[in-house]
Amino acid sequence: KSPIFGPEEVNSVEGNSVSITCYYPPTSVNRHTRKYWCRQGARGGCITLISSEGYVSSKYAGRANLTNFPENGTFVVNIAQLSQDDSGRYKCGLGINSRGLSFDVSLEVSQGPGLLNDTKVYTVDLGRTVTINCPFKTENAQKRKSLYKQIGLYPVLVIDSSGYVNPNYTGRIRLDIQGTGQLLFSVVINQLRLSDAGQYLCQAGDDSNSNKKNADLQVLKPEPELVYEDLRGSVTFHCALGPEVANVAKFLCRQSSGENCDVVVNTLGKRAPAFEGRILLNPQDKDGSFSVVITGLRKEDAGRYLCGAHSDGQLQEGSPIQAWQLFVNEESTIPRSPTVVKGVAGGSVAVLCPYNRKESKSIKYWCLWEGAQNGRCPLLVDSEGWVKAQYEGRLSLLEEPGNGTFTVILNQLTSRDAGFYWCLTNGDTLWRTTVEIKIIEGEPNLKVPGNVTAVLGETLKVPCHFPCKFSSYEKYWCKWNNTGCQALPSQDEGPSKAFVNCDENSRLVSLTLNLVTRADEGWYWCGVKQGHFYGETAAVYVAVEERKAAGSRDVSLAKADAAPDEKVLDSGFREIENKAIQDPRLFAEEKAVADTRDQADGSRASVDSGSSEEQGGSSR
């Protein structure tokens, strides 16, 4: 017996699509071997029509695809635009066509349902609107107009021109009689339900001279689009429901049991707690279309998602919907990286951000996820030399260590820095990750003076005290600018006396500025690193003033002032800064969502809160 399983008989009608799922044991070999769909010939051979290695027969060109889902042990063959010629015996299988790992499938494509003569077929999606047109003759112009639905053997009145409406259609049906010139009435049914499907009869007049017209209404439940994304990666659901629902509340929900569909996010401000920090609902276009980005994909995110429109912001009968089946591939190309980084007030964090190593030249970005309204992610820094004004001197994006990872350093932490941050690039949109910064109790490890004033033309020495835990780390000083932090020469002054219970391995490393000029004014960082991996940093602002008295300045911790006032973050520090987005590809596939740099709503951005790994703020 073959271990492959699938549908033995598939019956469809011309013009339709089929989606055939074949199940296989998900062993390592099976997951990666060739998958195929072939048609059995009269002499017993099986001619490949499509395979997972990219082959598509000319018979299937432009109308079929084969998708492998190794995690589930399934592959799916989609075939569209069916004709009766597609009827026949097929095999879905693994490996080579002639070997035994296959399953026989019979596909029968018929002309369609037997309909009464002169029956008009209306095929409409669930939740949409249908207009059934009913012609009549002049002698019935003044007579009663009605629409019946065939229920079993009996016609049941749905609506008529005297004002009757069947309770099942209340609030969503109307009968329109055209002007005197046109011998036509029409029945418009909104918010179509699956139960509305069936045979209808419209009638003008009630006697033997009445005009009758048959209609067959088919209400289609949307086929879910199969979406296959990597664990820790990102998915974007594009939802286009049409202009008729442009002003109706939109939602994305995930089907749980049965018809229950739990709201993931909606435009009324609801968001499921499991998606906190890793979801954005992009502002909708005038045509009512919108998109939802979910990042940091977890195994449990797999499932069926529906987007729709309803005033309640959740799925109701008659909501127009679109559907997706999301599969999350655990054999992910996206590396694990810490999803939580902890830092202390006044201290720093160094965040590692993965990106697709094939796109080393892409622009790197870091943004702060904000949950207000539908979520947004204003940019804070990029690799092109832009830093949001309120973050000057305390935020830097470094291309190191490179080869698929960049580093973001944020220091002078306050409790307001706690939150979710997204790493993204203008390249592969699936490589968007998130990290949550948590501010915990404790003291910064590195000790530096608060702010320092240097005198023009003199020498300035600024100390940085490193505790013994960093004895094996490289210690450095650098001058911050918006493209990074340029290394400066520094002197090891021996053990530090700034730490209690710390031995000879503590260090005092000083920065010396000789013959200070105006250009020396700015932010200086001292920090630790191991190779290209950065650890904790501390920042000092050096102001430069005219000479008052001769001599050099040697700053000690005791003389340290508070950090300069102009750098204190006020409550408005997340306000939008009017900086235009330079690269339209950053949010490719979406309309330019926002007109300011800050509003690059991460519409194609991503997060990784997919695991509980944590990283301390100071060292790797």
Epitope: F5, P7, E8, E9, V10, N11, S12, V13, N16, S17, V18, S19, I20, T21, Y23, P113, L194, S195, A197, Q218, L220, K221, E223, P224, Q255, S257, G258, E259, R304, Q325
Partner: nanobody
Framework: QVQLVESGGGLVQPGGSLRLSCVAS????????MAWFAQAPGKEREFVAA??????????YYADSVKGRFTVSGDNAKKTLDLQMKDLKPEDTALYFC??????????????????WGQGTQVTVSS
């Protein structure tokens, strides 16, 4: 209240035939997949056959043990499911359950992929 009611079970001789029927009422949807499972005394429920609907396409699935002997059919709109059983064998003796689910996805052979269940109808094949 959702109800799936099976009928058509009974005692039949080996080689004989039976037709099982299932009618669903109170379902909040036109079911997208319905199936038959069999449970022999002291054993787990086993998949027998299923039918799934997507739009105007139907998909029929069978267990290896019943291929060529059993035929599944149904009406999505009427929420009915039938199982025509021919050439019955003593090992087909079991309590036959009807199951339904709103979506035609997931492996149809796995009982956990169905939300609604009937009470069962007994089929006994014995001479």
């Amino acid at each position: 209240q959702v109800q799936l009611v099976e009928s058509g079970g009974g005692l039949v001789q080996p080689g004989g035939s039976l037709r099982l029927s299932c009618v669903a009422s109170g379902l909040p949807f036109s079911s997208s997949r319905m199936a038959w499972f069999a449970q022999a005394p002291g054993k787990e429920r086993e998949f027998v056959a299923a039918i799934g609907w997507r739009g105007r396409t139907s998909y029929k699935y069978y267990a290896d043990s019943v291929k060529g002997r059993f035929t599944v059919s149904g009406d999505n709109a009427k929420k009915t499911l039938d199982l025509q059983m021919k050439d019955l064998k003593p090992e087909d003796t079991a309590l036959y359950f009807c199951a339904a689910h709103p979506n035609d996805d997931g492996d149809p052979r796995i009982s956990g992929n169905y939300q609604y269940w009937g009470q069962g109808t007994q089929v006994t094949v014995s001479s």
